[in-house]
């Protein structure tokens, strides 16, 4: 697993550095998760040919994965810091069930999958501290999540491979869009 944020070689080499600001900590946390996703995608792509499938072919799925849209306030056109922050937190909370699904999907990267899940929880906490309007954040219903998880786990092998690939790809894209928006705040 990659070294957790705040413990990379640069930090060791520069102990005199200023403590990280809240924004820097969030930035580093997202980059750490992206590293984890990259490692998981490597294993997925080595195991199946899903990574070669076109976006159009993969779009034919019934997963309701969070995605950034212009109305969410994270794009430069219509940028709104608070609306965007709410979207990022809500989206990450919605991804949690899918990250739970990933937990038994990896052989050599089991630890990495756990690290991505745990780091995402930490990221959510960081972002919640930054948000002013916590009331606007809707938490997914645990019962709905439980039945979704059961349904995903009951799929055949091919569909499970497809689902794994789609989750990783969509999560990466969501984090990249979030990273870009957060750096404008």
């Amino acid at each position: 697993a990659p070294v957790p944020p705040g413990e990379d070689s640069k930090d060791v080499a520069a102990p005199h550095r200023q403590p990280l600001t809240s924004s820097e900590r969030i930035d580093k946390q997202i980059r750490y998760i992206l590293d984890g996703i990259s490692a998981l995608r490597k294993e997925t792509c080595n195991k199946s040919n899903m990574c070669e499938s076109s976006k159009e072919a993969l779009a034919e799925n019934n997963l309701n994965l969070p995605k950034m849209a212009e109305k969410d306030g994270c794009f430069q056109s219509g940028f709104n810091e608070e609306t965007c922050l709410v979207k990022i937190i809500t989206g990450l909370l919605e991804f949690e069930v899918y990250l739970e699904y990933l937990q038994n999907r990896f052989e050599s990267s089991e630890e990495q999958a756990r690290a991505v899940q745990m780091s995402t929880k930490v990221l959510i906490q960081f972002l919640q501290k930054k948000a002013k309007n916590l009331d606007a954040i809707t938490t997914p219903d645990p019962t709905t999540n439980a039945s979704l998880l059961t349904k995903l786990q009951a799929q055949n092998q091919w569909l499970q491979d497809m689902t794994t690939h789609l989750i990783l790809r969509s999560f990466k894209e969501f984090l990249q869009s979030s990273l870009r928006a957060l750096r404008q705040m």
Partner: antibody, heavy 122, light 107 residues
Framework: QVTLKESGPGILKPSQTLSLTCSFS??????????VGWIRQPSGKGLEWLAH???????YYNPSLKSQLTISKDTSRNQVFLKITSVDTADTATYYC??????????????WGQGTSVTVSS | DIVMTQSPATLSVTPGDRVSLSCRAS??????LHWYQQKSHESPRLLIK???QSISGIPSRFSGSGSGSDFTLSINSVEPEDVGVYYC?????????FGAGTKLELK
Amino acid sequence: QVTLKESGPGILKPSQTLSLTCSFSGFSLSTSGMGVGWIRQPSGKGLEWLAHIWWDDDKYYNPSLKSQLTISKDTSRNQVFLKITSVDTADTATYYCARSYDDYLYYALDYWGQGTSVTVSS
Amino acid sequence: DIVMTQSPATLSVTPGDRVSLSCRASQSISDYLHWYQQKSHESPRLLIKSVSQSISGIPSRFSGSGSGSDFTLSINSVEPEDVGVYYCQNGHSFPLTFGAGTKLELK
């Protein structure tokens, strides 16, 4: 292998609209983390970033020129476009398009086109 | 906007010299700092990414250091072909901004 090539009108008159095209190969603008930007450089001067467009169609503009700029893309044809309205002689420059791509969105411009020279003159 | 300030404006060197080019950001940009080289009548090319990451095809004599708002590009033994203008770039947030450049010339 990644290549980018700019094309434009060469010469135009003040108050006209400048239309530039960046045609690229070796990558797809539908890949997450991928972006293409426009940068210009008046002769003998420094680099000025103008606009950037991303895989998800998010667009960023230089605030000092925002009202004049429009960036767009045709992902299937591997092209990015920039329009600058109401040009002036100060817009005379070499215009470059460049790619940015990495997981962390570092906004580093790793491949550049050869540039297209634009002269605004009455 | 983040303002990037480069110094010196011009640097006259002798082949074999070790040189340092400075770049300062008006606010902290963490490690989102990149260096470009532009030779006469050519497009800029990425030299160093993210403060110190080397780029494929770029000679190892080029290296970068710094963090936060103060950055340095070093050339450990200048070659005649290194003549040109060197730009640093803020890659932290939009608008992307470049320094005015440091012109490297031979004495």
